[in-house]
């Protein structure tokens, strides 16, 4: 079996997670894509997904999660703004390909959000964001439901309040690739 690797992001409250998931562009350019959280002992839960078919570069926002699919370069950009400690957890990008199961894009993202002064950059972080205004409306794409034995995903919740309750214990034993990245503050 393929060993699942994780990329770890350590950010502070109020900052923005900004990750790129790459895919085979010839195969999946217009396929619907999703951002999921994986909790211990549970099936992956879909938090947000692109439209179907996925629109090139057009942002889809569900609460604090923004997805942008760049077809020509085969990449899905995922941003989670105004991070909260409760957002800590394990995430993954997937491609919906019904009737088959979703195709997972490597690597999984291990997000660790800690309390911090959102107005002050951390020791190795960059205070770059000057303006962030939450748009008055968000685009909510309908995400398909899967009920296969191995993968279950759900439609995005109406509120992001329950989107990212962390596991009671974050298991970091299998992290193979830890990267600290400069982030939006």
């Amino acid at each position: 079996a393929t060993k699942l690797t994780e990329e770890k992001y350590e950010l502070k409250e109020g900052q923005t997670l900004d990750v790129k998931c790459d895919y085979t562009l010839e195969k999946f350019a217009s396929s619907q894509k999703a951002w999921q959280i994986i909790r211990d002992g549970e099936m992956p839960k879909t938090l947000a997904c692109t439209e179907r078919p996925s629109k090139n570069s057009h942002p889809v926002q569900v609460g604090r999660i923004i997805l942008e699919d760049y077809h020509d370069h085969g990449l899905l950009r995922v941003r989670m703004v105004n991070l909260q400690v409760e957002d800590s957890g394990l995430y993954q990008c997937v491609i919906y390909q019904p009737p088959k199961e979703p195709h997972m894009l490597f690597d999984r993202i291990r997000l660790v959000v800690t309390k911090g002064f959102s107005g002050t950059p951390g020791s190795n972080e960059n205070s770059t964001q000057n303006v962030y205004k939450i748009p008055p409306t968000t685009t909510k794409a309908l995400c398909p439901l899967y009920t296969s034995p191995r993968t279950v995903t759900q439609a995005p919740p109406k509120s992001t309040a329950d989107v990212s309750t962390p596991d009671s214990e974050i298991n970091l034993t299998n992290v193979t690739d830890i990267i600290r990245v400069p982030v939006f503050n």
Epitope: K20, E68, D72, H73, T128, I134, P135, I179, R180, P182
Partner: antibody
Framework: EVQLVESGGGLVQPGGSLRLSCAAS????????MSWVRQAPGKGLEWVAN????????YYVDSVKGRFTISRDNAKNSLYLQMNSLRAEDTAVYYC??????????WGQGTLVTVSS | DIQMTQSPSSVSASVGDRVTITCRAS??????LAWYQQKPGRAPKLLIY???RLQSGVPSRFSGSGSGTDFTLTISSLRPEDFATYYC?????????FGQGTKVEIK
């Protein structure tokens, strides 16, 4: 064909202001992040600022924070950079560029800003 | 910020030569690196993105490789129009940052 055309550069005294414009055509302007990138004479490239598709987020390099403001008018397919409290070190060619996820894929021809007394 | 270090800063070569330029990131950037060519008085032109993918319309003599922290741009057989300055750009960590440039000059 994608086209980006900058204007508004010129000679300005230290402490002065200037507003750069970038007219975009050939693509759906409102679907893309846009950036300003500058290049001091004989030097390398430096990202200056960018703005989200709907204008709801703006980001700046530390050296221009509080002095420069990026904005856009999607109805006019235009990007702007308001530059205040200009310094000699802001002298550069300023390029308007389209962000495409992991690159600046299209660039304008640039407009020269010279800050000198 | 992620620092990008290019080497060499300049290289003298002849038409037909194979030229290699390297770019090193101060931390891992996976494959999110692009290469640009810039000629005097002109805007930069995208050559390679995602470390190794050739931008549409760019001649196949240009190629890119690498991942993580070390990346390479190779021009397999230098043409007269290739004499220019080349820059790398990392797009993994924000803000995106450029290398200082490598000038390819005529020997």
């Amino acid at each position: 064909e994608v086209q980006l055309v900058e204007s508004g550069g010129g000679l300005v005294q230290p402490g002065g202001s200037l507003r750069l414009s970038c007219a975009a055509s050939g693509f759906t302007f409102s679907s893309y992040w846009m950036s300003w990138v500058r290049q001091a004479p004989g030097k390398g490239l430096e990202w200056v600022a960018n703005i989200k598709q709907d204008g709801s987020e703006e980001y700046y390099v530390d050296s221009v924070k509080g002095r420069f403001t990026i904005s856009r008018d999607n109805a006019k397919n235009s990007l702007y950079l308001q530059m205040n409290s200009l310094r000699a070190e802001d002298t550069a060619v300023y390029y308007c560029a389209r962000d495409y996820g992991d690159v600046f894929d299209y660039w304008g021809q640039g407009t020269l800003v010279t800050v000198s007394s | 910020d992620i620092q990008m270090t290019q080497s060499p800063s300049s290289v003298s070569a002849s038409v037909g030569d194979r030229v290699t330029i390297t770019c090193r990131a101060s931390q891992g950037i996976r494959k999110w690196l692009a290469w640009y060519q810039q000629k005097p008085g002109r805007a930069p032109k995208l050559l390679i993105y995602a470390a190794s993918r050739l931008q549409s319309g760019v001649p196949s003599r240009f190629s890119g490789s690498g991942s993580g922290t070390d990346f390479t741009l190779t021009i397999s057989s230098l043409r007269p129009e290739d004499f220019a300055t080349y820059y790398c750009l990392q797009a993994h960590g924000f803000p995106w940052t450029f290398g200082q440039g490598t000038k390819v000059e005529i020997k």
